[in-house]
């Protein structure tokens, strides 16, 4: 679970150790602030739960790619 260290900065201190199915993911955001100990991805699931993930892991990168492509593909 991400932690807000102040109103402007949210950090991840631990990463999920479970791969999340891409069908459960709605969006993501990158955590790059130097105020945080780790660079991270926060996935938001379709039930609005936020999960911290390690951007160095391939499944995380693949999920980001999938979501990026999804947002640029016009829905028919």
């Amino acid at each position: 679970q991400p932690d807000a260290i102040n109103a402007a900065v949210t950090c991840c201190y631990n990463f999920t150790n479970r791969k999340i199915s891409v069908q459960r993911l709605a969006s993501y955001r990158r955590i790059t602030s130097s105020k945080c100990p780790k660079e991270a991805v926060i996935f938001k699931t379709i039930v609005a739960k936020e999960i911290c993930a390690d951007p160095k892991q391939k499944w995380v990168q693949d999920s980001m790619d999938h979501l990026d492509k999804q947002t640029q593909t016009p829905k028919t």
Partner: antibody
Framework: QVQLVQSGAEVKKPGSSVKVSCKAS????????MHWVRQAPGQGLEWMGR????????KFDPKFQGRVTITADTSTSTAYMELSSLRSEDTAVYYC??????????WGQGTTVTVSS | DIQMTQSPSSLSASVGDRVTITCKAF??????RAWYQQKPGKAPKLLIH???SLEHGVPSRFSGSGSGTDYTLTISSLQPEDFATYYC?????????FGGGTKVEIK
Amino acid sequence: QVQLVQSGAEVKKPGSSVKVSCKASGLTISHTYMHWVRQAPGQGLEWMGRIDPDNHNTKFDPKFQGRVTITADTSTSTAYMELSSLRSEDTAVYYCARGVFGFFEHWGQGTTVTVSS
Amino acid sequence: DIQMTQSPSSLSASVGDRVTITCKAFEDIYNRRAWYQQKPGKAPKLLIHGATSLEHGVPSRFSGSGSGTDYTLTISSLQPEDFATYYCQQFWSAPYTFGGGTKVEIK
């Protein structure tokens, strides 16, 4: 705050090698990737490659593959870039930079490498 | 490699002008692009990454837009400290590539 401090300018002969260091403070380098980008005089920016200091996995632009070695020492929070078989076209400012996502939030001050006979 | 073509290569503008720099990727990069500002003798500085994420401390007069292969950096009202060279960069796939740069000069 995050700081990346690079080693000083170098003058090298063609055919030789150069090793540039980049010491990080204000961050744990194993939590990021360390990249190297170069800029020839009056030219644009060129990504060379990166290392994951966690496991020493590297990725390079194929253009530099075989000629560049990127290493990292997590105990000293230092990344290194060694370029071999130097030629005059390698004269450039070499920058280290950090970032997991493929863009670069923090940069070193740059190290000028001059290759001249 | 994904080639990034930036235009114009240079432009002259006055303080207060609206300035637009464009970058075209040779394939879809799905908003995975960044913009940097570089002043002579200095390292580049990250301005914007991804769809619209303005780096902390970057003035709101800088904005990024675009999708697919076409992206734009806009400076809504040019300030004296904005005269510099600007680079776009794609981070959709390695090797990460930069545009050729746009030098913004004083008219």
